[in-house]
Amino acid sequence: TPEVWVQVQMEATELSSFTVHCGFLGPGSISLVTVSWGGPDGAGGTKLAVLHPELGTRQWAPARQARWETQSSISLALEDSGASSPFANTTFCCKFASFPEGSWESCGSLPPSSDPGLSAPPTPVPILRAD
């Protein structure tokens, strides 16, 4: 069964910068990736970026840069302009489409123990959902 993993990181050098990493584990080629975000209760979400392997990428604030890392994974850099960190309680969702096979989504958020003052970020633990 195809699966999607999501990892959210706070950048150690800039407390206002976050990066969302998403990847697709499964057969088939990716036809579109959509990254969205919203509150922890699943309400009030909106799109952050759309990545198409041929047509390019579109992104919306506060997304700063969306890019392909591999043919089946992407990263999205976010810039928090606020004094505090609203991203801390935010849910980020990545949906990968593989036409005509189907599409799959998984969501994740910044780990509550994230502290950029500590050592290097821990090994990513994929958050998986296979519906």
Epitope: S36, G38, G42, G45, T46, K47, A97, S103, E105
Partner: nanobody
Framework: EVQLVESGGGLVQPGGSLRLSCAAS????????MSWVRQAPGKGLEWVST????????SYVDSVKGRFTISRDNTKNTLYLQMNSLRAEDTAVYYC????????????????????WGQGTMVTVSS
Amino acid sequence: EVQLVESGGGLVQPGGSLRLSCAASGFTFSYYDMSWVRQAPGKGLEWVSTINSNAGRTSYVDSVKGRFTISRDNTKNTLYLQMNSLRAEDTAVYYCVEGDPHNFGLESLSLRDFGSWGQGTMVTVSS
């Protein structure tokens, strides 16, 4: 896996009405823009309407403005298309899709350009 299941299609006389529904599952429906697209017999895919994630913004192709209304219920994970004053030229398979084709300014649409897609429901307008 994401599932989009359309219903509500059928045979209707010109001037009649239909309400299409699209039941979504397997993803956070309330986070995503949704659209309706259609494919008339022997024709290419045509964008019909889009609604943003919180239903605060809608848009329509000129040929259906004033006749069709897109809406959504995020508590029920369902997308709707109310179609009034139907015409023969509205005859098509109607697909519920996740995404907004205007993201890339697509002139020639394909289902592969959307994030998710349903199997479609047939609407036939004929007397």
